[in-house]
């Protein structure tokens, strides 16, 4: 048993490098120590991420991909390990780092928020839907007046540069709009957003943020909401939101608001229709919203409410389309 052999020495890996391979993405690479004796044994590697956020894991490979913000730099260590059922032998650590990019922290953007929407494909695509992305941010408190910011996103291996910005009074970019993107929420891929900047007066610190596509996806409101009154019943129907997901992937929440007495009736539904008893003296406001449910994907947050439809006293029995 090599682990019990007093003289057995584990040597650290060599040629440990950290290379930025994309927005908020690094590749750690190392080689086995060429001087290691008994190289036929099952060596593993213990990787420790020291910054920006501590993490550690074991791997048999000699490279590892990390997805993480890089505006504060990145530092990691790796060592050779040899495991048995009752003990683990480890070499000394080797370390490497990526320096933080230049610029004072107060010059980078703050309060970065991003949301995605499903929209109808605007040109001859194989798929009828595409995903738009909107991001907004605040100018850094110490950013000079001539600062200009530029946004990029990476999803998987593809990176896109923003072409459509909104600006503040000083003509600085403070929001970005991508009418179509390659973002989807099929897997566990994270959306990386990177904003860098330029100024004649100071170095502008870049900023990276990772988003879960599930968390930022804004589900559209249900379509074609119709309301009919028959005697003392409300018949409410709607169609699924504009979405690449099929009908069975949605849960709905219905809100019936009695404007006379302020009473709100809320119903959680799987079906896309509902019948409710009403009185004949009140006016009602009806709204529906949707959320994607399992098993289609991890349940997401509720989408936007549909436009209110008003029915009841002093309003004709009607059908309204939205």
């Amino acid at each position: 048993d090599l682990l019990n052999h007093k003289k057995f020495l584990l040597l650290p890996p060599v040629n440990f490098t950290i290379k930025a391979t994309g927005l908020a993405q690094v590749l750690l690479h190392w080689d086995p120590n060429p001087d290691q004796e008994q190289r036929h044994v099952d060596l593993e590697y213990h990787v420790k991420i020291n910054a920006p956020q501590e993490d550690e894991y074991d791997t048999r490979k000699t490279e590892s991909k990390c997805v993480t913000p890089l505006h504060e730099g990145f530092a990691a260590s790796v060592r050779t390990i040899l495991k048995s059922s009752h003990t683990t032998l480890a070499s000394s650590w080797v370390s490497a780092e990526l320096k933080a990019p230049p610029g004072s922290p107060g010059t980078s953007v703050t309060n970065l928020t991003c949301t995605t929407h499903t929209v109808v494909s605007s040109h001859t695509h194989l798929r009828p839907y595409q995903v738009s992305l909107r991001c907004t941010w605040l100018v850094g408190k110490d950013a000079p007046e001539d600062t200009q910011y530029f946004l990029y996103y990476r999803f998987g291996v593809l990176t896109e540069k923003c072409q459509e910005y909104s600006r503040d009074a000083l003509n600085r970019n403070t929001a970005c709009w991508f009418p179509r993107t390659f973002i989807n929420s099929k897997g566990f891929e994270q959306l990386a957003v990177h904003i860098n900047g330029s100024s004649k007066r100071a170095a502008i610190k870049p900023f990276d943020q990772l988003f879960s596509p599930l968390a930022i996806d804004q589900v559209n409101p249900p379509r074609n909401v119709t309301v009919e009154i028959e005697s003392n019943s409300l018949y409410i129907q709607w169609e699924k939101p504009l979405s690449a997901f099929p009908d069975h992937c949605f849960n709905y929440e219905l809100k019936i608001y009695n404007t006379k007495n302020g009473h709100i009736q809320k119903e959680k539904l799987i079906a896309n229709k509902f019948i409710s008893k009403i009185d004949d003296v009140s006016t009602y406001s009806i709204q529906v919203r949707a959320a994607v449910s399992s098993p289609c994907r991890m349940p997401g947050r509720w989408g936007e409410w549909s436009q209110p439809i008003y029915v009841g006293k002093e309003r004709k029995s009607l059908v309204e389309w939205h």
């Epitope: 040109h123 001859t124 695509h125 194989l126 798929r127 998987g156 291996v157 593809l158 990176t159 896109e160 540069k161 072409q163 390659f182 989807n184 099929k186 897997g187």
Partner: antibody, heavy 118, light 106 residues
């Protein structure tokens, strides 16, 4: 009708360079990513390179990185592939193809043969 | 990189027969899979995308299925014009093709 027409290829010596072009018509060129795909004689298909809408991002297979450069001229609706330091492993029919990021290649050119030999 | 393993490499079938071609991805590609048909001396033509969506103009005897890492192309009632080489392709992480399946008539 979507059409992709590659320029003539030809015989080139190892270590030399060659530039391929692909003229696109029948669609809004700047609305799509474009790619080059190659096929060695009697072999399978191999993605070579992809370029984004405005040419700001380019992606390459490992074996051509640093030797091949994909570019585009949206005003001329033309895609290019500059191939340097060619070797016999680059001998193939080169196809220009339309796609859009994480999409398949929905239209292909007729292909152009590039032979690297002394 | 994602590897695509296609099987069989070649097959012979009779007219009117049903043909199945398999494609195995080295990791989950979330149905980002296409099938192409290539006839000798011609460029490939897209048949199926997103694992099971039929490209416009492609006969309905072609169908695709599968999820995760395992996918298949089915040709119902084989016609003489279906003699070709078929390739699968993933487009979830870069773009890689299977080795191809050469389909011949018995």
């Amino acid at each position: 009708e979507v059409q992709l027409v590659e320029s003539d290829g030809g015989l080139v010596q190892p270590g030399r360079s060659l530039k391929l072009s692909c003229a696109a018509s029948g669609f809004t060129f700047s609305d799509f990513y474009m790619a080059w795909v190659r096929q060695a004689p009697t072999k399978g298909l191999e993605w070579v390179a992809t370029i984004s809408y405005d040419g700001s991002s380019a992606y390459y297979r490992d074996s051509v990185k640093g030797r091949f450069t994909i570019s585009r001229d949206n005003a001329k609706s033309t895609l290019y592939l500059q191939m340097d330091s060619l070797s016999s492993e680059d001998t193939a029919t080169y196809y220009c193809a339309r796609h859009d990021g994480y999409y398949p290649f929905d239209y292909w050119g007729q292909g152009v043969m590039v032979t690297v030999s002394s | 990189d994602i590897r695509m393993t296609q099987s069989p490499a070649s097959l012979s079938a009779s007219l009117g027969e049903t043909v199945n071609i398999e494609c195995l991805a080295s990791e989950d590609i979330y149905s980002d899979l296409a099938w192409y048909q290539q006839k000798p001396g011609k460029s490939p033509q897209l048949l199926i995308y997103d694992a099971n969506s039929l490209q416009n103009g492609v006969p309905s005897r072609f169908s695709g299925s599968g999820s995760g890492t395992q996918y298949s192309l089915k040709i119902n009632s084989l016609q003489s014009e279906d003699v070709a080489t078929y390739f699968c392709q993933q487009y979830n992480n870069y773009w890689t093709f299977g080795g191809g399946t050469k389909l011949e008539l018995k």
